[in-house]
């Protein structure tokens, strides 16, 4: 049975600033690189037929659901892209994480401007601070890491706060063992 294709992002963030670039790639088993990929944005078929969909100079209209399909194989699970205009944007490697998997958080400054005194918060409590911008890395996520995250920082000497982001860590499914 052919596997469903999977959409991956490069850079890996599904929340980006207006004007930034992101490449969506339709990955699957033994798919030909010829023009055989269908891309769907908010349900509408895109003109792009390559296995990669490049979003250059992102606009707000680029926000939404993306799916891909190779030949007549099942559609991929959807990936949701959101385009923002703000001073700070909290980006996560994933918003739903399987327990035991890594989780990375990034407090991204508009136009890649320097951000100082960056503090990450979880459920309203400070998680970690540093004098310059820095990332948060959780090697093995646990259910306790679920929560609402945001970051604050200084850009051009002024204080800003990102929009909050809900992160959910789900328990890994139990392996099923069948007695012979």
């Amino acid at each position: 049975v052919p596997q469903k294709p999977k959409v991956s992002l490069n850079p890996p963030w599904n929340r980006i600033f207006k004007g930034e670039n992101v490449t969506l790639t339709c990955n699957g088993n033994n798919f030909f690189e010829v023009s055989s990929t269908k891309w769907f944005h908010n349900g509408s078929l895109s003109e792009e037929t390559n296995s990669s969909l490049n979003i250059v100079n992102a606009k707000f209209e680029d926000s939404g659901e993306y799916k891909c399909q190779h030949q007549q194989v099942n559609e991929s699970e959807p990936v949701y892209l959101e385009v923002f205009s703000d001073w700070l944007l909290l980006q996560a490697s994933a918003e739903v994480v399987m327990e035991g998997q890594p989780l990375f958080l990034r407090c991204h400054g508009w136009r890649n401007w320097d951000v100082y005194k960056v503090i990450y918060y979880k459920d309203g409590e400070a998680l970690k601070y540093w004098y310059e911008n820095h990332n948060i890395s959780i090697t093995n996520a646990t259910v306790e890491d679920s929560g609402t995250y945001y970051c604050t920082g200084k850009v051009w000497q002024l204080d800003y706060e990102s929009e909050p982001l809900n992160i959910t860590v789900i328990k890994a499914p139990r392996e099923k063992y069948w007695l012979q």
Partner: antibody
Amino acid sequence: EVQLVQSGAEVKKPGESLKISCKGSGYSFTSYWIGWVRQMPGKGLEWMGIIYPGDSDTRYSPSFQGQVTISADKSMSSAYLQWNSLKASDTAMYYCARDVGNGDYGLDVWGQGTTVTVSS
Amino acid sequence: QSALTQPASVSGSPGQSITISCVGTSGDIGRFNYVSWYQQHPGRAPKLIIYDVTRRPSEISNRFSASKSGNTASLTISGLQAEDEADYYCSSYTSSSTPYVFGTRTKVTVL
């Protein structure tokens, strides 16, 4: 009262190992960076390294990288400075100090210092 | 990472003002608004007197003030008093891997 209390003075021989401690109280120990500072007799302050007890993220001064190990134990609200093989040149006063917090720059709470003497 | 450069000694009479300089580079003092100042009396632990270039902890006298221009930070002690006689150190952020580097030490003498 916010304070850092350091372990007592140590007299050691060259080649011996040592671990000194710094216990925090009166604040959320895991939420502030803790730095270590060396002061050799009659000399100035030298920054050695810093640790965030919340996740044990550690940064070392290039001068001390590989010479010492900085660690922390959340359950004990303590930070540690360790040597595997002491040298006579390690004779100094060692201070731990807490960062101001919130990304503000400075060390606002200091331990009383631990005197380490290394002599054969 | 080289230490920041401070004058070895500065002196003044009671009631006078003195200024201690702390010279860095465009990669530390010149780049970041992260400078702190410490006072150390003989046999005592250092004490924070200025953080974030100009900010004073609440318990520190307003006779202590600080500023920064280019690659140089300065600490001014006004209305000099006998208890101000001590060693003074500046510190600056240099990089994420080396956040603290101290100055060379200035001995303040009250004449």
